[in-house]
């Protein structure tokens, strides 16, 4: 045979490729032997032209021979060398990690090394680097940043040999959500002040949305969804408006349906409506509330009343939106066009949330039947959501 | 199919006592507020009271409060209507009436109804 | 309360006339009305709801309109079996009342 050469080269196996002898052949001897690694011999029929060489050492050059034998006869030998590749260091695993430390640990490849290249990186790009000692088997992490995701990697180095890269991914601690997709998850991050805060919906940090949380009522952690304080806001406004939201987060404005149908898609939420009046104060929670999509003209779903304003939500529950310019109510009449607002109508309301401000005429005013009837338009009014089991959340983080 | 059977009508002496009963089957029970109408005979319809789906809010007619006491047990689905102070106006037919989805107040489903006499 | 006036108390007509009965509530109601037919010897059944709103089954000659204090039932061509006592109800508010009956007969 002729032209012996090795490809495929791994840590562990190698394919030895020749060029056949010209006269035909019955068998092929191989043999194969390394450094401190006992020769290893094998025949294979005359017909074949390669043969995969498995359970080599990692890191070690092999000298690899063959000849062809035809009854007693025997050819000549060829020879050739090849370096088996250095074998990569296995179970990188992150452990102890808190919010800017780390400690990696991982087990030592078979081959003799003379060191190993760590590199980490955070999803910002940030990229750092280190070589430590042949007989190192963990490292420390420091100067990390919290809430953050790391993607360390590991390679073993033997003089010009380098092994493949492992690696092994985890977030740093500090906050317990680095994305928030409410505000109870804010809350849970350790922020207790009502705000505006960043939330991302369903925890994508592309889908960023501004948002103010009380942090206050009832333990905190909603997302106001509605707020009616001054009259300084127009609340007669389109579909489309209403669907995108609108106002001043701080002032008085609505999210927007939209948003609330893929904060509500997110899990089960409770939905808290506050109230005052002259000094007066009402509450009433829903411990199940959502809004639908726009296919279903953001279809209301809301049960399990409690609180002391009384139960006037029950008379809109699986209704449509409505706005004057698109009546999806139950009524013969436009009920938002009637009642210059917009809401969840059907035949009309038993709440005018969005109705006109300091309108004490009949229906017309910002109302909440069962606490104040129809003939007094509310002072204020927030509407606002949060996880149905959020107190559990919180037990769980306070006992952390 | 839904329906309502309503039970315990009878003679009853007036200042006396009864409790009528209403079987409920077809659908469920606890998620809607139930009540009780009355009609005297040849006359109109007119509403004695009413209670939420949990049962945590009663309401009553002027004419029947502090005299009548409406509750319900969910795990068997019946309603009940404890009568007491009985008047010879309170002589009507008693229907059981289920309420709507939202609020309640409105009656899609009716019992055949009992009949109180209240009469010495 | 609310007090629910219909008229007329009572009507006579024929099979095939068209039957107009109106409620009219003492106090601005919005829509919360529904009507009820009543057979002699039998329960009440409601017919519409929400004011215009017609009940699952029932069928299309009947219809309701209004808003506010004034509503209106119409049988667009009445049948043997409408002949009945139809009630109007308020649902807007405790005590739910009714209006004190009409009654369709024959001519």
């Known amino acids: 045979p002729s032209g012996l050469v090795t490809a495929n080269i791994t840590d562990s196996e190698a394919l030895a490729r020749w060029q056949p002898a010209i006269a035909t052949v019955d068998s092929y001897v191989i043999s194969y032997t390394g450094e401190k690694v006992p020769e290893i011999t094998r025949t294979v029929s005359g017909n074949t032209v390669e043969y995969a060489l498995t359970d080599l050492e990692p890191a070690t050059e092999y000298t690899l021979r063959i000849f062809a034998e035809k009854g007693p006869q025997k050819s000549s030998t060829i020879t050739a060398k090849f370096t088996t590749d250095l074998d990569s260091p296995r179970d990188l695993t992150a452990t102890e990690v808190q919010s800017e430390t780390a400690l990696l640990t991982w087990r030592p490849p078979r081959a003799s090394v003379t060191g190993y290249l760590l590199v980490y990186e955070s999803v910002d790009g940030t990229v750092k680097e280190v070589i430590v000692g042949p007989d190192t088997t963990s490292y420390s992490l420091a100067d990390l940043s919290p809430s953050t995701h790391y993607t360390a990697k590991i390679q073993a180095l033997n003089g010009p040999l380098r092994s493949n890269m492992i690696q092994t991914i985890f977030t740093t601690i500090g906050l317990l959500y680095p994305f928030p997709k409410d505000c109870s998850q804010a809350m849970l991050n350790g922020d207790t002040t009502s705000g505006l805060y960043t939330i991302y919906l369903n925890g994508d940090k592309a889908e960023a949305l501004e948002v103010f949380c009380d942090m206050t009522s009832d333990g905190g952690g909603w997302i106001v969804f509605l707020r009616r304080k001054n009259g300084r806001e127009n609340f007669y406004q389109n579909w489309k408006a209403y669907a995108a939201g609108f106002g001043d987060r701080r002032e008085e404005f609505w999210l927007g349906l939209d948003n609330l149908n893929k904060i509500t898609a997110q899990g089960q939420y409770e939905l808290r409506v506050d109230l005052r009046d002259h000094g007066e104060t009402a509450f009433a929670v829903y411990d199940k509330f959502s809004v639908g999509d726009a296919k279903t003209r953001y279809k209301l779903k809301v049960e399990g009343y409690s609180g002391t304003a009384g139960d006037s939500m029950a008379y809109h529950n699986g209704r449509s939106f409505s706005t004057f310019d698109k009546d999806t109510d139950s009524a013969i009449t436009n009920c938002a066009l009637s009642y210059k607002g917009a809401f969840w109508y059907r035949n009309c309301h038993r709440v005018n949330l969005m109705g006109r401000y300091g309108d004490n005429n009949h229906s017309q005013g910002v109302n909440w039947f069962h606490w104040k009837g129809h003939e007094h338009s509310i002072q204020f009014a927030e509407m606002k959501l949060r996880p149905s089991n959020f107190r559990n959340l919180e037990g769980r983080r306070k006992r952390a | 199919q839904v329906q309502l059977v309503e039970s315990g009508g009878g003679l009853v002496q007036p200042g006396r006592s009864l409790r009528l009963s209403c079987a409920a089957s077809g659908f469920t029970f606890d998620d809607y507020a139930m009540h009780w109408v009355r009609q005297a005979p040849g006359k109109g319809l007119e509403w004695v009271s009413g209670?939420?789906?949990?049962?945590?809010?009663?309401y009553y007619a002027d004419s029947v409060k502090g005299r009548f006491t409406i509750s319900r047990d969910n795990a068997k689905n019946s309603l009940y209507l404890q009568m007491n102070s009985l008047r010879a106006e309170d002589t009507a037919l008693y229907y059981c009436?289920?309420?709507?989805?939202?609020?309640?107040?409105?009656?899609?489903?009716w019992g055949q109804g009992t009949m109180v006499t209240v009469s010495s | 309360d609310i007090q629910m006036t219909q008229s007329p108390s009572s009507l006579s007509a024929s099979v095939g006339d068209r039957v107009t009965i109106t409620c009219r509530a003492s106090?601005?109601?919005?829509?919360?009305l529904n009507w009820y037919q009543q057979k002699p010897g039998k329960a009440p059944k409601l017919l519409i709801y929400d004011a215009s709103n017609l009940e699952t089954g029932v069928p299309s000659r009947f219809s309701g309109s209004g808003s506010g204090t004034d509503f209106t039932l119409t049988i667009s061509s009445l049948q043997p079996e409408d002949f009945a006592t139809y009630y109007c109800q308020q649902s807007y508010s405790t005590p739910q009342t009714f209006g004190q009956g009409t009654k369709v007969d024959i001519k």
């Open positions: 209670i939420s789906g949990s049962g945590g809010s009663t």
């Open positions: 106090q601005y109601i919005q829509g919360f």
């Open positions: 009436a289920k309420g709507t989805v939202g609020e309640g107040d409105t009656f899609d489903i």
